[in-house]
Interface confidence: medium
């Protein structure tokens, strides 16, 4: 279905951009508030979207030091932008069995960003394999 596949592509491009933004932020890790943030790891299958929302809700902040503050704030804002939803995302929203954000181990910004990237990669790979098998549900 044309419009569905177009939506899927849009979703993939946004997810792909998020990986680049995380990579960019990692270069400014010393300019981030060194606060410990919930950082999901080894996320249970079907809880990826729940974990993704935990990363988005986390209070990642610029330390307001120097010239990088504006670009860091812009990128954090972009990280929080909601990607186009997929069937899987809609389905997972209704699951009540996923861990709460507070239950995940808290990590400093560097590890937080590494784990976020890892989850994004997992979600992209799942998405690609689901498309290969003719499904738009994961």
């Amino acid at each position: 279905h044309k419009s569905s596949s177009q939506g899927q592509d849009r979703h993939m491009i946004r997810m792909r951009q998020l990986i680049d933004i995380v990579d960019q932020l990692k270069n400014y890790v010393n300019d981030l508030v060194p606060e410990f943030l919930p950082a999901p790891e080894d996320v249970e299958t079907n809880c990826e979207w729940s974990a993704f929302s935990c990363f988005q809700k986390a209070q990642l902040k610029s330390a307001n030091t120097g010239n990088n503050e504006r670009i860091i704030n812009v990128s954090i804002k972009k990280l929080k932008r909601k990607p186009p939803s997929t069937n899987a995302g809609r389905r997972q929203k209704h699951r009540l069995t996923c861990p709460s954000c507070d239950s995940y181990e808290k990590k400093p910004p560097k590890e937080f960003l590494e784990r976020f990237k890892s989850l994004l990669q997992k979600m992209i790979h799942q998405h690609l394999s689901s498309r290969t098998h003719g499904s738009e549900d994961s």
């Epitope: 491009i13 792909r16 951009q17 990986i19 990579d23 960019q24 972009k78 990669q121 992209i124």
Partner: antibody
Framework: EVQLVESGGGLVKPGGSLRLSCAAS????????MNWVRQAPGKGLEWVSS????????HYADSVKGRFTISRDNAKNSLYLQMNSLRAEDTAVYYC?????????????WGQGTTVTVSS | AIQLTQSPSSLSASVGDRVTITCRAS??????LAWYQQKPGKAPKILIH???SLESGVPSRFSGSGSGTDFTLTISSLQPEDFATYYC?????????FGQGTKLEIK
């Protein structure tokens, strides 16, 4: 200064191969998605391929799929395009292009281009 | 693939004129569109990203608007250095595609 410099273009016979390189400087190369865009003589722009910052996600135009391979070496600040089974219609100026960062849509840094001519 | 149709294909105008170039997408592309300027023998240069955001260093006489399927690039008062070819490009889905270009010539 933010800069992209392409090399590797030249004259090749149909069915032959070429490897284009792009040297990046003046920015954190490993943070950006990169693209190849081409322009045939007297024609418009055609997107060829893209690769994400960590090489996790790659796409090709249908016209080059199965023949061209994009890759990057972040340690060397370099982008590559391996072109095999070249055809006359691949004759073009090939641009190495940085995709605009921080989640925005656009290609903000372009190299000067390298010319590929496929002819017998 | 999403097709982008630019109009007009060519345009003659004078210094000081207000010029509008349109780009129509075959499907909804949200605001995932950029505009470029290219002069003969040179690489393209980005003018507008995200449909309406002016790229840093680009003169304010350039502006972009639109969302969905219809987009416009406007030059409020043409300068001699603006005579060039202009392209739109979509980033909504693969393959990324460009419009066929609009050549802006001196009248």
């Amino acid at each position: 200064e933010v800069q992209l410099v392409e090399s590797g273009g030249g004259l090749v016979k149909p069915g032959g191969s070429l490897r284009l390189s792009c040297a990046a400087s003046g920015f954190i190369f490993s943070s950006y998605s990169m693209n190849w865009v081409r322009q045939a003589p007297g024609k418009g722009l055609e997107w060829v391929s893209s690769i994400t910052s960590g090489s996790y996600y790659i796409h090709y135009a249908d016209s080059v799929k199965g023949r061209f391979t994009i890759s990057r070496d972040n340690a060397k600040n370099s982008l590559y395009l391996q072109m095999n089974s070249l055809r006359a219609e691949d004759t073009a100026v090939y641009y190495c292009v940085r995709e605009r960062g921080w989640g925005y849509y656009g290609m903000d840094v372009w190299g000067q281009g390298t010319t590929v001519t496929v002819s017998s | 693939a999403i097709q982008l149709t630019q109009s007009p294909s060519s345009l003659s105008a004078s210094v000081g004129d207000r010029v509008t170039i349109t780009c129509r997408a075959s499907q909804d592309i949200d605001s995932a569109l950029a505009w470029y300027q290219q002069k003969p023998g040179k690489a393209p240069k980005i003018l507008i990203h995200d449909a309406s955001s002016l790229e840093s260093g680009v003169p304010s006489r350039f502006s972009g608007s639109g969302s969905g399927t219809d987009f416009t690039l406007t030059i409020s008062s043409l300068q001699p250095e603006d005579f060039a070819t202009y392209y739109c490009q979509q980033f909504n889905s693969y393959p990324y595609t460009f419009g066929q270009g609009t050549k802006l010539e001196i009248k």
